[in-house]
């Protein structure tokens, strides 16, 4: 970690890459602890922030502006040396979000992908971005970063992901940077949830009154399993939204959701998840496909008032 | 949104102590410090010192250095300002405002009243 | 300590007029100046730092410049709910120092 003998090692908290007006910490570990250190920035714009100043334990930066966006390194103290300072750090880039118009980011095939598989994240824009760059929520290394291709005034990166295992389920935002502006990056395009399935035992899913019904009748899928799944998802083919409910355990010691459908208007094929509270967006195999047929007069769709959208939001906690 | 809420208005005799309490919400508690401002009647604003919410480690301003305690309970974010020994020249507004080592406070608490009188 | 010396420290202005309020630091403060609102009866509120740089939230009536030892805020057209006292302060050196303030009624 250290990467020599007589070099500290600095490193930010939370993460390398920070909203503009935001903060970040900045640690120098040095000899096997947080000692007083220096710091510095590398074009040396910026710098009154340091005016020689001895930080202690670590150094709290912001508001940020786009200024602070670079390279920094410190010099952890030695008071036994003919300096009184170690060599310099590892180099640490700071990029500052929020200089620019978001891109957008979608995923191919999907959002939901079986584990062990590949995703790719397609992160775009019609500003002219030079640079792209993909970043995983709660991660604080640098995020991946790819040349932007420009083709009939879109430009654009593809992030290849996989083969995928749970470390790598997430929500993901992309990034654009400008020539000249490397560490300037764009606002963050919207949240897209990367969920893993396929890593636990499937629940089972049934209706209620059955799976076909009469126009206009009410109808509630329920999702249960013997495993101890904190939450449940449920999805319908064809749509992309899914609904999430608590489980509840039942007396038979089974844990369950109670997924109100409302009243029958329109059939369709579900299928519902487990996940655990821990591992949010890490999903069981999928239940068997459930028909659910309407007999009657069908019309457009089924109403759906609570369904999030499944961009975002699935891999944050239900409180 | 950030937002940081002082404890109540307190009335104490001379040589008492005090514990004025503000608590964080709306960001990580941890990635920035906790900055204390006092504001004596007909007086402007005076920096007291600060408190680094990352590593815990407080600085104070020369004028508040021996009576004065800055302290973080991380676990409910919230950082606390302690005056111990009060004189009547502690009637103060007392703020605290979100900062860190570059010494901007971009939000700050709603001020918590200190009157200190026999 | 650097000394941050505010000034007018009174100003009274009608509604669209625009107004300046200077403050001179002792000392080269590098551009790390902050200026702050606080409104009868609030808490401040921060309206500009590193000279120029408006807070999340700020109109862009207000804005800030200078260098070395001077530096101004200025309200471009100033309206009703700009009545208060503003702080200039310096985020350059421990301990960090306010100006004595500016008091801005509206006529």
């Known amino acids: 970690l250290m990467g020599g003998q007589d070099k500290p090692f600095l490193s930010a908290r939370p993460s390398t890459v920070v909203p503009r007006g935001g903060h970040v910490a900045l640690q120098c570990h040095y000899r096997r602890g947080f000692n007083n250190f220096m710091l510095y920035k590398e074009d040396r714009s910026h710098v009154p922030i340091f005016h020689g100043r001895i930080f202690q334990e670590s150094f709290i930066m912001g508001p940020v502006t786009p200024a602070h966006a670079g390279t920094y390194r410190c010099r952890g103290s030695r008071p036994h040396s003919l300096t009184g300072w170690s060599a310099p750090s590892n180099p640490l880039v700071i990029m500052v979000t929020g200089n620019h118009r978001k891109p957008s980011l979608l995923a191919h095939p999907g959002p939901l992908l079986k584990s062990g598989e590949t995703v790719i994240l397609q992160c775009w824009s019609d500003v002219m971005f030079e640079h792209f760059f993909l970043h995983r929520e709660g991660i604080s290394e640098d995020p991946s970063r790819l040349v932007g291709q420009i083709h009939d005034g879109v430009s654009k990166a593809n992030f290849s992901i996989g083969p995928l295992m749970p470390v790598l389920a997430g929500t993901y935002r992309c990034y654009g940077s400008v020539p000249h502006s490397p560490y300037q990056l764009s606002a963050p395009s919207d949240p897209l949830d990367i969920v893993i399935t396929g890593l636990y035992e499937k629940p089972s899913l049934s209706a209620q009154p059955g799976p076909t019904v009469q126009a206009g009748e009410n109808v509630t899928l329920s999702c249960s399993s013997w495993s101890s799944y904190d939450i449940y998802h449920l999805s319908r083919e064809g749509e992309a939204h899914e609904r999430r409910l608590r489980a509840v355990p039942k007396v038979n010691r089974t844990f369950q959701a109670d997924f109100p459908l409302g009243p029958a208007t329109h059939g369709g094929t579900y299928r519902c998840f487990g996940s655990f509270r821990a591992l949010p967006c890490v999903w069981s195999n999928s239940s068997d496909p459930l028909l659910v047929s309407v007999t009657g007069n069908p019309s457009s769709s089924w109403p759906s008032p609570t369904e999030p959208s499944s961009k975002s939001g699935i891999c944050r906690h239900l409180h | 949104q950030v937002q940081l809420v002082q404890s109540g208005s307190e009335l104490k005799k001379p040589g008492a102590s005090v514990k004025v309490s503000c608590k964080a919400s709306g960001y990580t508690f941890t990635t920035a410090g906790m900055q204390w401002v006092q504001k004596s009647p007909g007086q402007g604003l005076e920096w007291m010192g600060w408190?680094?919410?990352?590593?815990?480690?407080?600085k104070y301003a020369e004028d508040f250095k021996g009576r004065f305690v800055f302290s973080l309970d991380t676990s409910v974010s919230t950082a606390y300002l302690q005056i111990s020994s009060l004189k009547a020249e502690d009637t103060a507004v007392y703020f605290c405002?979100?900062?860190?080592?570059?010494?901007?406070?971009?939000?700050w608490g709603q001020g918590t009243t200190v009157t200190v009188s026999s | 300590d650097i000394v941050m010396t505010q000034s007018p420290s009174f100003l009274s202005a009608s509604v669209g007029d625009r107004v300046t309020f200077t403050c001179k630091a002792s000392q080269d403060v590098s551009t790390a100046v902050a200026w702050y609102q606080q409104k009868p009866g609030q808490s401040p509120k921060l309206l500009i730092y590193?000279?120029?740089t408006r807070h999340t939230g700020v109109p862009d009536r207000f804005s800030g410049s200078g260098s070395g030892t001077d530096y101004t805020l200025t309200i471009s057209s100033v309206q009703a709910e700009d009545v208060a006292v503003y702080y200039c302060q310096q985020h350059y050196s421990t301990p960090w120092t306010f100006g004595g303030g500016t008091k801005v009624e509206i006529k």
């Open positions: 590193w000279t120029s």
């Open positions: 405002a979100r900062g860190g080592d570059e010494g901007v406070m971009d939000y």
């Open positions: 408190i680094n919410s990352h590593s815990g480690v407080p």
